[in-house]
Amino acid sequence: LKGQEFAPSHQQVYAPLRADGDKPRAHLTVVRQTPTQHFKNQFPALHWEHELGLAFTKNRMNYTNKFLLIPESGDYFIYSQVTFRGMTSECSEIRQAGRPNKPDSITVVITKVTDSYPEPTQLLMGTKSVCEVGSNWFQPIYLGAMFSLQEGDKLMVNVSDISLVDYTKEDKTFFGAFLL
Amino acid sequence: LKGQEFAPSHQQVYAPLRADGDKPRAHLTVVRQTPTQHFKNQFPALHWEHELGLAFTKNRMNYTNKFLLIPESGDYFIYSQVTFRGMTSECSEIRQAGRPNKPDSITVVITKVTDSYPEPTQLLMGTKSVCEVGSNWFQPIYLGAMFSLQEGDKLMVNVSDISLVDYTKEDKTFFGAFLL
Amino acid sequence: LKGQEFAPSHQQVYAPLRADGDKPRAHLTVVRQTPTQHFKNQFPALHWEHELGLAFTKNRMNYTNKFLLIPESGDYFIYSQVTFRGMTSECSEIRQAGRPNKPDSITVVITKVTDSYPEPTQLLMGTKSVCEVGSNWFQPIYLGAMFSLQEGDKLMVNVSDISLVDYTKEDKTFFGAFLL
């Protein structure tokens, strides 16, 4: 058999076959972090665990200083879940006091940074109003989708309030990407 | 053309090319559950439909007795959605009665069992406080991420309360995995 | 090296190797919807952006008139997020007026249409009761799973109420699919 016989008729020479096992992949898990200074209208980025527990990076996908570095151009599936937790939101306190009832919110954004482009690009956003009756609340926001990325792109996860992120368990808050 | 010409320069002989169509894959859908005994601090596992309707298993990925069996080592994307439904949570009843306001919660865990390892590993958890004002509530929890699994590993989905799971439709509650 | 040497022993001639880069893929993003007539018990389908911003279709995956067209049989991962937003749900208004407390809801359905089959098939559903205390609420519903599709199948996203869909940002509401 020649290699040609395994290739479908629309196989192009410029799109080489490659083993699935050598594709860039990462699954990062939550790590404790201290709140940092950030600009008022800019959501802070999360740090991640990249090698302990369930976390890993492989095949030239590297993690450094809050960023996943994309080592190869292509289409990637990117996902994250952030579990938030907090005390009763101000929303219900304001409501009890008879003042205008503007709900609090929790937001997760997966952001792409391209060195050649001045502004970060928001790839995915999950945002939810929080106006809970209970004294303690907790809930996840999950995101996932496919994007065309370029070698050198950097991915990060930003949240509306780091202090509300549940960092207690690696299965509750995570971030990953893999080349399709 | 020789097969070699399709292989990128970093292709290793030990990472063979393989057809995508022969990779282990499964999508399981909800079935009506028979309530089972389980330990107080251990969430019960769900049963699944594996061949009717939208459900399938293929390429040596098998389902047996609540478990998906991993037939081949590699990186898998694993996902599940569980739709919960219930009457007003005790939380709001307790609140109305002026008692301490501890919210109820709903939780989904995707768990890995490895025969050589004494205890299950929680891969993914989605947990949400439920403190609804309405008399009837319903909502999904979705989870999905990539993990490195070994041949022989078993996957299951555990929930905090089987009686709250919506088993009425195969598109509302499901569980799947596929080798990347 | 011959192509044969890259093929694992269970490689079948009828399951040809193929380059990942030439697989059908699409990521569609929200556009402002023009309200359309729809039957009372049938959820309306969303329109999508298919080429501007983050949106793309490639490798014979085409978008036309609310539908993603599947160009090749195989197993696809399909996903969507819809962010909803609204004013206080009737649920709490009804409750305050002392009338029966039926919660409102928001629902997303990913539907498959097969020309040879008379009825659409609901692949995925995310449905949530909305009974918010706050005057303005917003929240996403995310769905994603793997399905075996046939060449010629069409996919669409239906929602319970188009007027509640947040169409303001391409990262909040989206729809995608890719051949595995």
Epitope: V31, R32, Q33, T34, T36, H47, E49, E51, L52, G53, L54, N65, K66 | Y117, E119, T121 | -
Partner: antibody, heavy 124, light 107 residues
């Protein structure tokens, strides 16, 4: 949940060796780092070394040549052996699972999970 | 190796008192400092990491502050269960040195 259970108390003669075990549950020793810390009676805590998740080890230079850390992945157990014992080695020996945390752009290690301790008495 | 100097070595206080313990590093540890509580016959318990972040489940009466080489643990209103020995630990580099400890006793 995470637990580290250590072997029982030991009495040893000077010059002998002692091997303390730390059986963990709730995590795998191939996925997390297990450290050893000792505490002499009425004294402070002293870091001895670490068994990294990948199987490598690092030791405090003070104990270099006398301490050996090993593990058995099949039983999820880490061992610390200290040789050429002297009376000043009398202490409670703890295993601990390290945790990583970030401040600004740097990461640091602390010890959120500890074993119950093993008293080793060195006496002639 | 980084040296950690803790003071005082012991302190007597009453329930309801505010107590402060300090820890000085021999070089800048960039807020890579943790505080532990240890009761007799028990293992240490992590209270604070990153100089000022409260570990999950630790009461809010415990707080930490400091930067560079100087760090402080404060207990705002002592409770009976707080009488114990407290240790600081640098997490920047091996050998992850601990302070000698501060014994908090009932006056």
């Amino acid at each position: 949940q995470v637990q580290l259970v250590q072997s029982g108390a030991e009495v040893k003669k000077p010059g002998a060796s002692v091997k303390v075990s730390c059986k963990v549950s709730g995590f795998s020793v191939t996925s997390y780092n297990v450290h050893w810390v000792r505490q002499a009676p009425g004294q402070g805590l002293e870091w001895m070394g670490v068994m990294w998740s990948g199987g490598n080890t690092d030791y405090n230079s003070k104990f270099q040549g006398r301490v050996t850390m090993t593990r058995d992945t099949s039983t999820n157990t880490v061992y610390m052996e200290l040789s050429s014992l002297r009376s000043e080695d009398t202490a409670v020996y703890y295993c601990a699972r390290a945790g990583r945390y970030y401040h600004d752009s740097n990461y640091y290690w602390d010890f959120p999970y500890w074993g119950q301790g093993t008293l080793v008495t060195v006496s002639s | 190796d980084i040296q950690m100097t803790q003071s005082p070595s012991s302190v007597s206080a009453s329930v309801g008192d505010r107590v402060t313990i300090t820890c000085r590093a021999s070089e800048d540890i960039y807020s890579g400092l943790a505080w532990y509580q240890q009761k007799p016959g028990k293992s240490p318990k992590l209270l604070i990491y990153g100089a000022s972040s409260l570990q999950d489940g630790v009461p809010s009466r415990f707080s930490g502050s400091g930067s560079g080489t100087d760090y402080t643990l404060t207990i705002s209103s002592l409770q009976p269960e707080d009488f114990a020995t407290y240790f600081c630990q640098e997490g920047l580099k091996s050998p992850y040195t601990f302070g000698a400890g501060t014994k908090l006793e009932i006056k």
